[in-house]
């Protein structure tokens, strides 16, 4: 689990398929600093 | 094509509060966090924070909290930042960024904070 | 919170000319944490390098980023007008995220 300040965690139900795959909700990547803007 | 499109100038009284908008396009709105960044006359760029409109949690820069709010609405894919109890100090240009590596910026909202 | 000190200031170069900018952070960070924009003057500012060394889309290739820890560097090529600006790092790796003060190129 990501503790950093910069992390936005999602624990959100149903996020994994039963595949695995990630479903498509549109959920934010969950490590916001590593990204620029 | 990604677009931010942010409201127009604004001059407004010391003590007041001002709503700016950044409405987005060419996205999802939700995908991606909103960043919001204040650059003061001949100076640097300052990061206040950023919302996350999947589900409205925000991050502050501590110095804009009780400052800054940042909010979004969904349906029109539009952030929003209000400013309160203005003063001269407040008086820049404010930009909304899309999180993501991408690079794509609103162009910046003037305000001008004079009695 | 991490301040980012940028070197130098200010600097003037010709064209052809290579330049390298410096950004040392008060605290080591992630070299993921790290990027560069560049603002035009009237214009909004933009990213050139994210995550310390990959180039954003769109960016020529004369610019380049390297580092880690506490010492981070831009670099570009062969100078041309074109890229007169000011260049800034900034870090996401603590909250708040931080800019340098910022360097402003302009030409000789």
């Known amino acids: 689990a990501c503790d950093t300040a910069t992390c936005v965690t999602h624990r959100l139900a149903g996020l994994l398929s039963r595949s695995g795959g990630v479903v498509k909700n549109n959920f934010v990547p969950t490590n916001v600093g590593s990204k620029a803007f | 094509e990604v677009q931010l499109q942010q409201s127009g100038p604004e001059l407004v009284k010391p003590g007041a509060s001002v709503k700016m908008s950044c409405k987005a396009s060419g996205y999802t709105f939700t995908s991606s966090v909103m960043h919001w960044v204040k650059q003061k006359p001949g100076q640097g760029l300052e990061w206040i924070g950023y919302?996350?409109?999947?589900?409205?949690?925000?991050k502050y820069n501590e110095k804009f909290k009780g400052k800054a709010t940042l909010t979004s609405d969904k349906s029109s894919s539009t952030a929003y930042m209000e400013l309160s109890s203005l003063t001269s100090e407040d008086s820049a240009v404010y930009y909304c960024?899309?999180?993501?590596?991408?690079?794509?910026w609103g162009q910046g909202t003037t305000l001008t904070v004079s009695s | 919170e991490i301040v980012l000190t940028q070197s130098p200031t200010t600097m003037a170069a010709s064209p052809g000319e290579k330049i390298t900018i410096t950004c040392s952070a008060s605290s080591s960070i992630s070299s993921i944490y790290l990027h560069w924009y560049q603002q035009k003057p009237g214009f909004s500012p933009k990213v050139l390098i994210y995550r310390a060394s990959n180039l954003a889309s769109g960016v020529p290739a004369r610019f380049s980023g390297s580092g880690s820890g506490t010492s981070y560097s831009l670099t570009i090529g062969t100078m041309e007008a074109e890229d007169v600006a000011t260049y800034y790092c900034q870090q996401g790796s603590t909250i708040p995220f931080t800019f340098g003060s910022g360097t402003k190129l302009e030409i000789k």
């Open positions: 919302i996350n409109p999947y589900n409205d949690g925000t």
């Open positions: 960024a899309k999180g993501g590596n991408d690079g794509y």
